[in-house]
């Protein structure tokens, strides 16, 4: 009987010879549970597992804790891969996180963190980041040290307010902090002076809602 080959991430898919962009089935570490993810096999050497994408506002990102845990959306379009899978994956080995951003004026930028992982659900999927480089700001737009993840039904921010309810979307809110890539999608010419848009403050400044975002991870030793 032929053994079923399973892949933990898109880097393993790439190294197995699958070098075409697309949706691949990945397997949770130390488990048979599967998840579908989009793999970017072209950008920066390939092997990137896409954990978030915004591009057209077709998917509602104001979701529950459980939905952010297991993932939602369509891997070929707008989606969130799932906090549980990303947490398990990034605690197996060292991963880098690249965040690619597009504004409405045709500009692109990125932030690259040389070490990224999420704590377990018991610790509210707190984000841990080290070593920022890139063109989307010299200061991290994800507050440091990292915060717990918050959703509309899971308020773990550092604010007496409820950041997720006001800003919409699940995110690692501070009080409320300089970013939220899961905010409301605003079309061009309606994307300025918005407090609840798709924000990356240290690139675009105050109240600017972005056109497109992608969050992707890859093993540091790829």
């Amino acid at each position: 009987k032929e053994e079923q080959i399973s892949f933990r991430d898109c880097a393993e898919v790439f190294k197995s010879g699958h070098t075409t962009n697309g949706i691949y089935t990945l397997t949770f570490p130390n488990s048979t549970e599967e998840i579908k993810a989009y793999c970017d096999m072209e950008a920066g050497g390939g092997g990137w597992t896409i954990i978030q994408r915004r591009e057209d506002g077709s998917v509602d990102f104001q979701r529950t804790w459980k939905e952010y845990k297991v993932g939602f959306g369509n891997p070929s379009g707008e989606y969130w891969l799932g906090n549980e899978f990303v947490s398990q994956l990034t605690n197996q080995q060292r991963y880098v996180l690249k965040i690619h951003l597009k504004d409405w004026e045709g500009n692109e930028a990125y932030s690259l963190y040389e070490h990224f992982y999420l704590s377990s659900e018991e610790l509210n999927y707190r984000i841990h980041l080290k070593g920022l480089t890139g063109t989307a700001g010299k200061i991290s737009s994800i507050s440091q040290p990292g915060n717990d993840f918050s959703t509309k039904d899971g308020d773990n921010d550092k604010c007496i307010c409820k950041c997720s309810q006001m800003l919409t979307g699940g995110w690692w809110f501070d009080a409320c902090g300089p970013s939220n890539l899961n905010g409301m999608y605003y079309p061009q010419r309606q994307n300025t002076n918005k407090f609840n848009g798709i924000k990356w403050y240290y690139w675009k400044g105050s109240g600017y809602s972005l056109k497109a975002t992608t969050m992707m991870i890859r093993p540091a030793d790829f």
Epitope: C159, K162, L167, C176, P178, N193, K194, F195, K199, S206
Partner: nanobody
Framework: EVQLVESGGGLVQVGDSLRLSCAAS?????????VGWFRQAPGKEREFAAG???????AYADSVRGRFTISRDNAKNTVYLQMNSLKTEDTAVYYC????????????????WGQGTLVTVSS
């Protein structure tokens, strides 16, 4: 162009009350994530005093909690700061500011600012 205009400052005695007003033109306050009152005493840094979120929730600095109250009148597009039991250390220029981003207590995240109104508390 957005203009925030503060009023209501003046010279008062210790223990007195004042109500500051911040009126906005060119934008409604509901478009901001947070409208904050900051104050700057002579020779000191500008510091957060009180703020009100779009949701209506409020926040206060420890130094003013229980004495100051922030409120909003959407119909008049005005935010107020009611200041009771004033102390000499409350003497400062008080600024109204509007923010779309960031942490509410950090002045650098506020985009629109008024010119300020002076409050002097004498003994």
């Amino acid at each position: 162009e957005v203009q925030l205009v503060e009023s209501g400052g003046g010279l008062v005695q210790v223990g007195d009350s004042l109500r500051l007003s911040c009126a906005a033109s060119g934008r409604t306050f509901s478009t901001y994530l947070m409208v904050g009152w900051f104050r700057q005493a002579p020779g000191k840094e500008r510091e957060f005093a009180a703020g009100i979120w779009s949701s209506g929730d409020t926040a206060y600095a420890d130094s003013v909690r229980g004495r100051f109250t922030i409120s909003r009148d959407n119909a008049k597009n005005t935010v107020y700061l009611q200041m009771n039991s004033l102390k000499t250390e409350d003497t400062a220029v008080y600024y109204c500011a509007g923010s779309y981003d960031g942490n509410y207590y950090i002045p650098g995240f506020y985009k629109d600012w008024g010119q300020g109104t002076l409050v002097t508390v004498s003994s």
